[in-house]
Structure formats: structure tokens, C-alpha cells
């Protein structure tokens, strides 16, 4: 995805813009948006970006708030690209088992698992 | 999801069973399975479990290898439950922005981002 700045810098800038525009964004006190109830964020990217779309449609555009939504759109593009890469390479069972073991290992150590 | 053991223990047991049965599982040298090319595993759960399904259909069942696939099926159920929880609570913008900030923060610090 051709972005002028690397994705990592894009994420940092977006966090800063989010803080800057928070007051403007929360002005709509009646709007309802799906909020995931757990911290395994990657599982919820679809809902997160749907929520961003709802928020954008209700926010007066212009200035750097437009930049915020542009950035979020580029982040979405990056994530969509990552999702595409989930199934692009078909490899031997050995490689798949390595990945599965890694996935379960990450789940074991890093996921917030409710009992 | 009613499982006899907590999900965290289930994951640990599954990792052990995966090591135990690795030789049996890699016996099929011609089989090709999609393997994600990045380490943001949570984005690829669909493909991972599709791959598990392919592997299961090609593996002679019986004994503890059956237990391995049963466990993996329970882990899938857990993840499906977590995915459902992504959109169940529609809250105010304030709560959504908290979650978005958290998501971007995790992306900033924990994701493996390719430039």
C-alpha cells in the first residue's frame, strides 16, 4: 500500500490526532457504536473499522480531523493487505504446523483469555 | 462455551499434543496448506482453522490424535465466541474512542509491522 510514511509512523501520528480531536469526536453524545468487550483487538478489526465509518459519517470534516480519518483508512488498507496474506502461500504440513504451534504459543502467553 | 477445562489449560494441552503427534501429522508430504506470511496471528484465525480442517481430513484418527483435533475444535469455538463479542455492545462514542486508542496503541507497540 503506497503511503507517504511507513505504517508504524502512520499509527503514531493517528494516535496523536485521535487525542487532538477527541473533544470534537465525542460531541455527538447520542451515537451508538459497537465496542468489543475483550482486548483481543485483532479479532475485531472489522467492527472497529465499521465503527470508524459510523463516526466519520457523523463528524463535520475539514482540517486535521480529515487527516485523522484518512490515516485510519490507510491503516485499514494495511490490515486488509495483511489479511490477504493469511492465505496466499500454500506450503508443506511442516510449515503449517510451525505456524500453528506459534499461534497457540502466542495464544498461551499473550492473549487475554477469560475463564 | 462449556469445556471441561479452562481455555488456557486447553491451549497448553493442545501444544503438548501437537508436539507428540508431529511425526504422524507430517507423514503426508504432498499435502499443501495455506500458511500466513506474517506473525499477526489473530488476523488469520479463519485460514488457520481451515488448514486444521484440511489436515484433520487427511489424518488417520484414533487415540490422542483425535483428542488433539477435538481440542482445536474447542479452541475454534472459543475464538468464534470472542469474535461474536466484537459487536454485541453498542456504546457511546467515548467508549469506542477508548477502545480505538487502545487498539492503535497495541498496534504501535506489539504488532509486527512491515515497512
Amino acid at each position: 500500500i503506497p503511503t507517504e510514511i511507513p505504517t508504524s509512523a502512520l499509527v503514531k501520528e493517528t494516535l496523536a490526532l485521535l487525542s487532538t480531536h477527541r473533544t470534537l469526536l465525542i460531541a455527538n453524545e447520542t451515537l451508538r457504536i459497537p465496542v468489543p468487550v475483550h482486548k483481543n483487538h485483532q479479532l475485531c478489526t472489522e467492527e472497529i473499522f465499521q465503527g470508524i465509518g459510523t463516526l466519520e459519517s457523523q463528524t463535520v470534516q475539514g482540517g486535521t480531523v480529515e487527516r485523522l480519518f484518512k490515516n485510519l483508512s490507510l491503516i485499514k488498507k494495511y490490515i486488509d493487505g495483511q489479511k490477504k496474506k493469511c492465505g496466499e502461500e500454500r506450503r508443506r504440513v511442516n510449515q503449517f504446523l510451525d505456524y500453528l504451534q506459534e499461534f497457540l504459543g502466542v495464544m498461551n502467553t499473550e492473549w487475554i483469555i477469560e475463564s | 462455551i462449556p469445556t471441561e477445562i479452562p481455555t488456557s489449560a486447553l491451549v497448553k494441552e493442545t501444544l503438548a499434543l501437537l508436539s507428540t503427534h508431529r511425526t504422524l501429522l507430517i507423514a503426508n508430504e504432498t499435502l499443501r496448506i495455506p500458511v500466513p506470511v506474517h506473525k499477526n496471528h489473530q488476523l488469520c484465525t479463519e485460514e488457520i482453522f481451515q488448514g486444521i480442517g484440511t489436515l484433520e481430513s487427511q489424518t488417520v484418527q484414533g487415540g490422542t490424535v483425535e483428542r488433539l483435533f477435538k481440542n482445536l475444535s474447542l479452541i475454534k469455538k472459543y475464538i468464534d465466541g470472542q469474535k461474536k463479542k466484537c459487536g454485541e455492545e453498542r456504546r457511546r462514542v467515548n467508549q469506542f474512542l477508548d477502545y480505538l486508542q487502545e487498539f492503535l496503541g497495541v498496534m504501535n507497540t506489539e504488532w509486527i509491522i512491515e515497512s
Epitope: 453524545e29 447520542t30 451515537l31 451508538r32 459497537p34 468487550v37 465499521q50 465509518g53 459510523t54 459519517s57 | 461474536k84 463479542k85 459487536g87 454485541e88 455492545e89 453498542r90 456504546r91 457511546r92 467508549q95
Partner: antibody
Framework: PGLVAPSQSLSITCTVS????????VHWVRQPPGKGLEWLGV???????DYNSALMSRLSISKDNSKSQVFLKLNSLRTDDTAMYYC?????????????WGQGTTLTVSS | SSLSVSAGEKVTMSCKSS????????????LAWYQQKPGQPPKLLIY???TRESGVPDRFTGSGSGTDFTLTISSVQAEDLAVYYC?????????FGSGTELEIK
């Protein structure tokens, strides 16, 4: 509660059965005599709360998952708080769906 | 408002919202319909503007999109005597309509 004097507080407990408060949200709705329904607030399955802004300063909702109980507290009661108070269950879904309602608790605010 | 109909007749009641209850992202309309019989708590009939709650007779149908919604009872029965409320599920607070009282002639 029955009859309560103005400026006092109201506390109502809604005890549920057949489902878990960790999976289902619970809403509170009231209905003044001979009038329509007014949504008061909700406690989500996750424990978060949202209130009708018209009552926000006087209303609080909490729960005890282990006892399957949801609590409504309304402070500084006024005569126009006289109503039937209902708790209602909202299943896990992105759509609001108050599929089971309690029989209601009558409150009369009068001096 | 109130409506008076004979048993067996078709009846439609409307609910108008001051703002759109349609989410353009997922094309869902966030509106529910309830029936309240005298001396009873409300009962859910329709959610998501058109999805009938399980156990609700198929003579009840919800339709509409955006700001205009309709509840239709295809053939009114004596037991349908009640007040019918719509409820906004799009934004806070989840306001109810003022209700339509259905009388059976």
C-alpha cells in the same frame, strides 16, 4: 418500595434466573400511570453502564453477577418519578431486543 | 393515538423518527416494536425493524427504513387488544414512541 416520600431514594433489585448476567445485558424502563414507556438505563454484560441523560445525575445501575441480581438506585425522588419500574433482558446481539420483562415494581412518590 | 378495527381486518400503525435509524454501513435499521396488554409488561414483537421475535404469530410484520416504519397486523384477533410501542435502537437514549392503542370493535 411502594410509597416513598419526595427527596428520598429508591432502590430496586431485579433477580434473574435461567441466564447469566455475564452474557446478557439488563435495561430498566419505567411507565407512569396511564402513560407511555421511558427508557432509564442499561447495565451491559461487560459491566459498563449507559443512562438516559435526563436522569443521569440521579440514577445508578449496578449488578452482582454471582447472585444474578441487578440493582437500580434513583436519588432525590420527585412526584413525577411515580411509575411502574421494569427490568428487561437484552440478549447478546448488536440489535436491541428486550425479550423478557419483569412484572414490574410500583413506586408512588408522595408526601 | 388509537385505532379501532374489527376482528379479521388488516391494520397498520406507523412510527416516524426525527432522525434516520438506518446504519448505512451495515444496512441495518435499528428499531423494535412491543405490544403491551392491559396490566402486563411489554412484549417484544419485532426487532431490527423487520425481524419477528420467535413465538410471535406471523400475522405481525415490521417494515420500513430510515425514518418511516410500519407495524402491520394482517388479520386482527381479539387478543391483539393492546398498546403498541416502537423503540429507537439507533442512538441514546432508547426512546419509545408515544404508543398506538388498538381497540377491537
Amino acid at each position: 418500595p411502594g410509597l416513598v416520600a419526595p427527596s428520598q431514594s429508591l432502590s430496586i433489585t431485579c433477580t434473574v434466573s435461567g441466564f447469566s448476567l455475564t452474557s446478557y445485558s439488563v435495561h430498566w424502563v419505567r411507565q407512569p400511570p396511564g402513560k407511555g414507556l421511558e427508557w432509564l438505563g442499561v447495565i451491559w454484560a461487560s459491566g459498563g453502564t449507559d443512562y438516559n441523560s435526563a436522569l443521569m445525575s440521579r440514577l445508578s445501575i449496578s449488578k452482582d453477577n454471582s447472585k444474578s441480581q441487578v440493582f437500580l438506585k434513583l436519588n432525590s425522588l420527585r412526584t413525577d418519578d411515580t411509575a411502574m419500574y421494569y427490568c428487561a433482558r437484552d440478549p447478546p446481539s448488536s440489535l436491541l431486543r428486550l425479550d423478557y420483562w419483569g412484572q414490574g415494581t410500583t413506586l408512588t412518590v408522595s408526601s | 393515538s388509537s385505532l379501532s378495527v374489527s376482528a379479521g381486518e388488516k391494520v397498520t400503525m406507523s412510527c416516524k423518527s426525527s432522525q434516520s435509524l438506518l446504519n448505512s454501513g451495515n444496512q441495518k435499521n435499528y428499531l423494535a416494536w412491543y405490544q403491551q396488554k392491559p396490566g402486563q409488561p411489554p412484549k417484544l414483537l419485532i426487532y431490527g425493524a423487520s425481524t419477528r421475535e420467535s413465538g410471535v404469530p406471523d400475522r405481525f410484520t415490521g417494515s420500513g427504513s430510515g425514518t418511516d416504519f410500519t407495524l402491520t397486523i394482517s388479520s386482527v384477533q381479539a387478543e391483539d387488544l393492546a398498546v403498541y410501542y416502537c423503540q429507537n435502537d439507533h442512538s441514546f437514549p432508547f426512546t419509545f414512541g408515544s404508543g398506538t392503542e388498538l381497540e377491537i370493535k
